[in-house]
Amino acid sequence: QGHLVHMTVVSGSNVTLNISESLPENYKQLTWFYTFDQKIVEWDSRKSKYFESKFKGRVRLDPQSGALYISKVQKEDNSTYIMRVLKKTGNEQEWKIKLQVLDPVPKPVIKIEKIEDMDDNCYLKLSCVIPGESVNYTWYGDKRPFPKELQNSVLETTLMPHNYSRCYTCQVSNSVSSKNGTVCLSPPCTLARS
């Protein structure tokens, strides 16, 4: 009763909210809510009733499985969705789905904060810039990942000649998408002309 399932999807996609188990047999009524008290649709053994809500026109209920189909989800659709079933016995059963809608991450821009040649070593400070997003960062030097402790929006490192890479890539990702930005240097330690 009331187990919470988490779902993360990309904005603009079509989503199916459903439960993993089969519905109670010959149930009397079924209701989908969002934010606990806003009804989206109700089925009462004769028909589906779609109520005035921001979902009207872009939801469809499958009474057989209880699945709710939502088209073109947006970040504003982030919510806990509740499916409530009224059984023939008079009891109710609830299932909850926490839906997180994320925008695809934008392509990052790599900003060169500082490059300095220091006695054959190369001091490098690069920042990976994307507009206010909660994302994960992974830095690569010639497609080889840097150590985990360097994985944030700023890459700051001193490279020895045997560690030089020509190109540095920042990969930004969330749970629904990822994008890369790359900057290339001329060995030993200068910005390549693009």
Epitope: K28, Q38, E42, D44, K49, F51, E52, G90, N91
Partner: antibody, heavy 121, light 107 residues
């Protein structure tokens, strides 16, 4: 906040009709049903009937059949109960109550404050 | 029509007491039972539905049990605000019918 606000007290003559209103707020009116329940002075509760605010479907207790009409106005989120051919035994407080479902489940989660209808010559 | 019979019709109790009210249906109603509370001059307030499910906002000292024909409302530790009349109601079939009520009074 869910609220059901009923119209004011009425005094009616025997044989007359009364129409009680129940204005809903704080929720999507059409997503729930409304039942009407009455309570004579010092007595218990008596269910009169139910209406779906979604499609106007109704079910009335046999006792009131032909004498009661339940309607809704979705534009104002208001339910109405009209009782005709009033007798002195219709003196009671009339309550509206919200059903948890748009099709009646018989489970009421919110009640109006009640409307006292007095039938007296 | 389904007849609902409550017992006792009244009970005297003190704050902190455990109070039990029973309700019997004239036929099997499975779990289609609700309980409400009414104070003098006020509208009823929903307490329990589906025999044992607590309405939102109702204190956990209220609990319901039973199925078929025999049902119980229990107040585990009576509070001053619990002195009222309690009604059971069947939701199994039209017409919905109520018990005659049980008045919980101060001893």
């Amino acid at each position: 906040e869910v609220q059901l606000v009923e119209s004011g007290a009425e005094v009616k003559k025997p044989g007359a009709a009364v129409k009680v209103s129940c204005k809903a707020s704080g929720y999507t009116f059409t997503a729930y049903g409304i039942s009407w329940v009455r309570q004579a002075p010092g007595q218990g509760l008596e269910w009169m009937g139910w209406i779906s605010a979604y499609d106007g479907d109704t079910n009335n207790a046999q006792k009131f059949q032909g004498r009661v009409t339940m309607t809704t106005d979705t534009s104002s989120s208001t339910a109405y109960m009209e009782l005709r051919s009033l007798g002195s035994d219709d003196t009671a407080v009339y309550y509206c109550a919200r059903d948890r479902y748009s099709s009646s489940s018989g489970y009421f989660d919110y009640w109006g404050q009640g409307t006292l209808v007095t039938v007296s010559s | 029509d389904i007849v609902m019979t409550q017992s006792p019709s009244s009970v005297s109790a003190s704050v902190g007491d455990r109070v039990t009210i029973t309700c019997r249906a004239s036929q099997d109603i499975s779990s289609w039972l609700a309980w409400s509370q009414q104070k003098p001059g006020k509208a009823p307030k929903a307490l329990i539905y589906a025999a044992s499910s607590l309405q939102s906002g109702v204190p956990s000292r209220f609990s319901g049990s039973g199925s078929g024909t025999d049902f119980t409302l229990t107040i585990s530790s009576l509070q001053p605000e619990d002195f009222a009349t309690y009604y059971c109601q069947q939701a199994n079939s039209f017409p919905y019918t109520f018990g005659q009520g049980t008045k919980v009074e101060i001893k």
